[in-house]
Interface confidence: medium
């Protein structure tokens, strides 16, 4: 349904608070370096204009598209050229090229300071102005995560304010706040990674990739829902994500609200687990639906083989309606297997498709495809074996030790990748152990495989910005569903020319002593990556010796009276002993 004024339509649908929040997120995701107050000015200008259009839809400019209105605001920013360089060239383009240009300048790794929560300062800010505090949270997260799912960020901002509402009255603010903020931080990072994968799926592999992912996921969650219903939900959900990934945050949030309403209005035919979600207010409702537990599998489902292996009409079905037939295969497989990872289900569908392509060209197709389910078995066995091996290693080494083992493994596979990226990715991979290995058997595979998909997507996104390894490019671009098996199959790079030993990378100062434990770990792990880049063939024993020497050196100097002097004297000795150990 067309509206005379798109901005008036969205303002009325969303209400002022959500409208302002979403506009702030949009500007913060595009202009990631601008100060908060600058963004607030832009938001207020656009909000006032929206109100004018609500009062009179025929007012000058109200008929303009949201991209035009947003882009015009962005292009008004005085410091655009100095702060953002060639992003300013976008302003010379017309819509829709201008918006595409802004999107292409989003930075997944902006150079912004780490957010360090100081309970007293934050509580003072919260008490002074709750609305501003809410907006500041949206701004800080959005600029660091330029693809964050906007309506979900509104949900987290409300939760964040709720934590301060509760904790700023507590006697020990820190004890109340810090664990809650840390828990939220983990959830926010996971949510950011999930949306980044959705956007990458659409951008790099087309919306069909996201649709397939959603068919599998929703069929697992809603196994009682019929294929027609799942297909409708997938179509609507894909539209929502396409809009958010494309920067159309107002449309995205509006359509997401409509989808939540539809799901709740039709919960009887979708899932028995939605009742509680549907009683909540909008943002909580949408979040709750997204996280809802899987419904029970309907009883007496016929075996998959009946329709997809035994039926003589398989090739007819496949050839006359490929997407619909493969979609129903994915739906039927997924609803029967909540214990499988979505990525594994997609691999099964891909292999099934390849089998039909091959068999349906033969003289006796049925004889060829009738054993297809035996052929698919290895796709389930492979991740199960890998999970067992890695969880055993994790249990033996603990999280930090497991991270270090992964640093060694991945630096040897792709030593060209930048050290900060290798450290970040390996640390995240190591956390999979803590997150997934403790889960019951039925939840291990989806937890592990799907979490790994998020981390490897992060690697792919960072690597795309500055490509240095053909192997990484190949694994990232060839097949979305086979990324993890592709990285698992990589062997140590024998063509790599080791880096020269750089003493600067092993020069430390007294500031290391006051770092939080996590930061200390990162310093050590950075040194480990650099060692491996210098000596990729170093044995486990050599690496162990060097790292033990390094820890002893840091402990000794941090215990010294004159720490800086100790680092100055002992540092060069460490360099010599390291080179000797690796000789």
């Amino acid at each position: 349904d067309t509206h005379k004024s798109e901005i008036a339509h969205r303002f009325k649908d969303l209400g002022e608070e959500h409208f302002k929040g979403l506009v702030l997120i949009a500007f913060s995701q595009y202009l990631q370096q601008c100060p908060f107050d600058e963004h607030v000015k832009l938001v207020n200008e656009l909000t006032e204009f929206a109100k004018t259009c609500v009062a009179d839809e025929s007012h000058a400019g109200c008929e303009k598209s949201l991209h035009t209105l947003f882009g015009d605001e962005l292009c008004k920013v005085a410091s655009l050229r100095e702060t953002y360089g060639d992003m300013a060239d976008c302003c010379e383009k017309q819509e829709p090229e201008r918006n595409e240009c802004f999107l292409s300048h989003k930075d997944d790794s902006p150079d912004l300071p780490k957010l360090k929560p100081d309970p007293n300062t934050l509580c003072d800010e919260f008490k002074a102005d709750e609305k501003k505090f809410w907006g500041k949270y949206l701004y800080e997260i959005a600029r660091r995560h330029p693809y964050f799912y906007a309506p979900e960020l509104l949900y987290y901002a409300n939760k964040y304010n709720g934590v301060f509402q509760e904790c700023c009255q507590a006697e020990d603010k820190g004890a109340c706040l810090l664990p809650k903020i840390e828990t939220m931080r983990e959830k926010v990072l996971a949510s950011s990674a999930r949306q980044r994968l959705r956007c990458a799926s659409i951008q790099k592999f087309g919306e069909r990739a996201l649709k397939a992912w959603s068919v599998a996921r929703l069929s697992q969650k809603f196994p009682k829902a019929e294929f027609v219903e799942v297909t409708k939900l997938v179509t609507d959900l894909t539209k929502v994500h396409k809009e958010c990934c494309h920067g159309d945050l107002l449309e995205c949030a509006d359509d997401r609200a409509d989808l939540a309403k539809y799901i709740c209005d039709n919960q009887d035919t979708i899932s028995s687990k939605l009742k509680e979600c549907c009683d909540k207010p909008l943002l909580e409702k949408s979040h709750c639906i997204a996280e809802v537990e899987k419904d029970a599998i309907p009883e007496n489902l016929p075996p998959l083989t009946a329709d997809f292996a035994e039926d003589k009409d398989v090739c007819k079905n496949y050839q006359e309606a490929k997407d619909a037939f493969l979609g129903s295969f994915l739906y039927e497989y997924s609803r029967r297997h909540p214990e499988y990872a979505v990525s594994v289900l997609l691999r099964l569908a891909k292999e099934y498709e390849a089998t039909l392509e091959e068999c349906c060209a033969k003289d006796d197709p049925h004889a060829c495809y009738s054993t297809v389910f035996d052929k698919l078995k290895h796709l389930v066995d492979e991740p199960q074996n890998l999970i067992k091996q890695n969880c055993d290693q994790f249990e033996k080494l603990g999280e930090y030790g497991f991270q270090n083992a992964l640093i060694v493994r991945y630096t040897r596979k792709v030593p060209q990748v930048s050290t900060p990226t290798l450290v970040e990715v390996s640390r995240s991979l190591g956390k999979v152990g803590t997150r997934c290995c403790t889960k019951p058997e039925s939840e291990r595979m989806p937890c592990t495989e799907d979490y790994l998909s998020l981390i490897l997507n992060r690697l792919c996104v960072l690597h795309e910005k500055t490509p240095v390894s053909e192997k990484v490019t190949k694994c990232c671009t060839e097949s979305l569903v086979n990324r993890r098996p592709c990285f698992s199959a990589l062997t140590p790079d024998e063509t790599y020319v080791p880096k020269a030993f750089d003493e600067k990378l092993f020069t430390f100062h007294a500031d290391i002593c006051t770092l939080p434990d996590t930061e200390k770990q990162i310093k050590k792990q950075t040194a480990l990556v650099e060692l491996l880049k210098h000596k990729p063939k170093a044995t486990e024993e050599q690496l162990k010796t060097v790292m033990e020497n390094f820890v002893a050196f840091v402990d000794k100097c941090c215990a010294a009276d004159d720490k800086e002097a100790c680092f100055a004297v002992e540092g060069p000795k460490l360099v010599v002993s390291t080179q000797t150990a690796l000789a």
Partner: nanobody
Framework: EVQLLESGGGLVQPGGSLRLSCAAS????????VAWFRQAPGKEREFVAG????????YYADSVKGRFTISRDNSKNTLYLQMNSLRPEDTAVYYC???????????????????WGQGTLVTVSS
């Protein structure tokens, strides 16, 4: 829930024609795989013809190919079976069956259809 109601059966001479109808309620007929089965006295229920939902892929048993045509009218929510060149061996009770939530796949296996009509008798005799 899907309710199915067949009509149009009767007595017809060999070589004659009949058109069976199956009115569906509780479900849009274009959203579900539907089929006609038949059961002759003392015999197993057998697949006659089927049509996928969402996509109009039709299926026929070899014994009726070229003589029978399955179709549906979505606006009337009704399934049809046009039977021409009828033979005495076509004598049977004809049943309409539905497989909701399966918009594509029509199976020839009766057990895979959860919803059935009460049947309509077709007698081909001179």
């Amino acid at each position: 829930e899907v309710q199915l109601l067949e009509s149009g059966g009767g007595l017809v001479q060999p070589g004659g024609s009949l058109r069976l109808s199956c009115a569906a309620s509780g479900r849009y007929i274009d959203e579900t795989a539907v089929a006609w089965f038949r059961q002759a006295p003392g015999k197993e229920r057998e697949f006659v013809a089927g049509i996928g939902g969402g996509v109009d892929i039709t299926y026929y048993a070899d014994s009726v190919k070229g003589r029978f045509t399955i179709s549906r009218d979505n606006s009337k929510n009704t399934l049809y079976l046009q039977m021409n060149s009828l033979r005495p061996e076509d004598t049977a009770v004809y049943y309409c069956a539905a497989r909701p939530g399966r918009p594509l796949i029509t199976s020839k296996v009766a057990d895979l259809y959860p919803y059935w009509g009460q049947g309509t008798l077709v007698t081909v005799s001179s």
